[in-house]
């Protein structure tokens, strides 16, 4: 004989478990239906009647099959230093990520809780490691023969121009000034054949590393505690 398909609610076999998209209801002592994403349990099952599911209200969601009595609240609106990369729907929470020029200083399960402005390297310093979505810019002092005259979160140290006759020698924060009409630019640092500048190294000053400008921070407050869960919201 073919095995009979059990319809919810039903009592599981002793030591058995409920099927996918079902949960064991302790009160009814039955396997009962979970609610699909975008819905929640409005009325719990009994021995004779199944779970009643209802749609999540505005600004609330459930992402998984669940039996929560209330949908979860979507996070607060994205702050001014963030962009909304996923809207709040009945099936998913709002996701806020940091806008260009900012990085995530404090992440959360999805998106970012706290964005901070990317560090700007001041003159005499260049970007050693560019910022990413989750890490700040790392600055380094410009090595002899290179300079940066900008306050920037993207500019690297660039080589001084090569002068036939130097009017003002370059330093870490200023390019060399030539008297000749046609200066040449040396190749990027790290190139295989990096020509030495015509002017002597003693003309370059290497500043001691100093902290870059403090990043501005902007806070995105965490979402309040979630509504009570009857158990795991997983399948």
């Amino acid at each position: 004989l073919p095995a009979q398909v059990a319809f919810t609610p039903y009592a599981p076999e002793p030591g058995g478990t409920c099927r996918l998209r079902e949960y064991y209801d302790q009160t009814a002592q039955m396997c009962c239906s979970k609610c699909p994403p975008g819905q929640h349990a409005k009325v719990f099952c009994t021995k004779t009647s199944d779970t009643v599911c209802d749609s999540c209200e505005d600004s609330t969601y459930t992402q998984l099959w669940n039996w929560v009595p209330e949908c979860l609240s979507c996070g607060s609106r994205c702050s001014s230093d963030q962009v909304e990369t996923q809207a709040c729907t009945r099936e998913q929470n709002r996701i806020c990520t940091c806008r260009p020029g900012w990085y995530c200083a404090l992440s959360k399960q999805e998106g970012c809780r706290l964005c901070a402005q990317l560090r700007k390297c001041r003159p005499g310093f260049g970007v050693a490691r560019p910022g990413t979505e989750t890490s700040d810019v790392v600055c380094k002092p410009c090595a002899p023969g290179t300079f940066s005259n900008t306050t920037s979160s993207t500019d690297i140290c660039r080589p001084h121009q090569i002068c036939h006759v130097v009017a003002i020698p370059g330093n870490a924060s200023m390019d060399a000034v030539c008297t000749s009409t046609s200066p040449t630019r040396s190749m990027a640092p790290g190139a295989v054949h990096l020509p030495q500048p015509v002017s002597t190294r003693s003309q370059h000053t290497q500043p001691t590393p100093a902290p870059s400008t403090a990043p501005g921070t902007s806070f995105l407050l965490p979402v309040g505690p979630s509504p009570p869960a009857e158990g795991s919201t997983g399948d």
Partner: antibody, heavy 118, light 107 residues
Framework: QVQLQQSGPELVKPGASVTISCKAS????????IHWVKQRPGQGLEWIGW????????KYHEKFKGKAILTADTSSTTAYMQLNSLTSEDSAVYFC???????????WGQGTTLTVSS | DIQMTQTTSSLSASLGDRVTISCRAS??????LNWFQQKPDGTIKLLIY???RLHSGVPSRFSGSGSGTDYSLTISNLEQEDMATYFC?????????FGGGTKLEIK
């Protein structure tokens, strides 16, 4: 047997505050909502709000925001409702009730009579 | 807020009668309706939830029906202990609201 035992009657002066308690027993206190309901003499029932002791989330009827404050103490399995700036309009019987889902109250306390009078 | 109206504020019936108490919502409440019994001593009990589900321990002579905006509670074979006030309550939309009550007296 599930029980919700409420505190005794209160006689308070206008402008004062009062706290009513609701002691829960014989069930898992943190897995159920506790609701508070107002009943004025000879009138219907009014839902005030709920608290979920499991995570202390509260939800209030707009009308009672600022009037009622709901709290719960999981160690003593007791829910509390504080009523502030009392007037004669607050004279009523107040019930606590529990629910597993948010909307239907399966067990009720016996009620606490509050009289506001000078 | 959703208004719940119980047009009959009181009714009297004889023991053994079949009594129906009605409740109307100001908008569709999609069967999210409960019935409560309040005894003269003030104690309140849940009888029926979600229109027709009988709460555990409630005698089977109580039943509920309805849909949309119109709902009813039926007590068949009325008993003395059924003398009480009956309230309907919607839980479709916050805030949850109650009807004004129907007081049932025994003739």
């Amino acid at each position: 047997q599930v029980q919700l035992q409420q505190s005794g009657p209160e006689l308070v002066k206008p402008g004062a505050s009062v706290t009513i308690s609701c002691k829960a027993s014989d069930y898992s206190f943190t897995n159920y909502y506790i609701h508070w309901v107002k009943q004025r003499p000879g009138q219907g029932l009014e839902w005030i709000g709920w608290i979920y002791p499991g995570n202390v989330i509260t939800k209030y009827h707009e009308k009672f925001k600022g009037k009622a404050i709901l709290t719960a103490d999981t160690s003593s399995t007791t829910a509390y409702m504080q009523l502030n700036s009392l007037t004669s309009e607050d004279s009523a019987v107040y019930f606590c009730a529990r629910s597993r889902a948010t909307g239907y109250f399966d067990y009720w306390g016996q009620g606490t009579t509050l009289t506001v009078s000078s | 807020d959703i208004q719940m109206t119980q047009t009959t504020s009181s009714l009297s019936a004889s023991l053994g009668d079949r009594v129906t108490i009605s409740c109307r919502a100001s908008q569709d409440i999609r069967n999210y309706l409960n019935w409560f019994q309040q005894k003269p001593d003030g104690t309140i009990k849940l009888l029926i939830y979600y229109t027709s589900r009988l709460h555990s321990g409630v005698p089977s002579r109580f039943s509920g029906s309805g849909s949309g905006t119109d709902y009813s509670l039926t007590i068949s074979n009325l008993e003395q202990e059924d003398m009480a006030t009956y309230f309907c309550q919607q839980f479709n939309t916050l805030p949850w609201t109650f009807g004004g009550g129907t007081k049932l007296e025994i003739k």
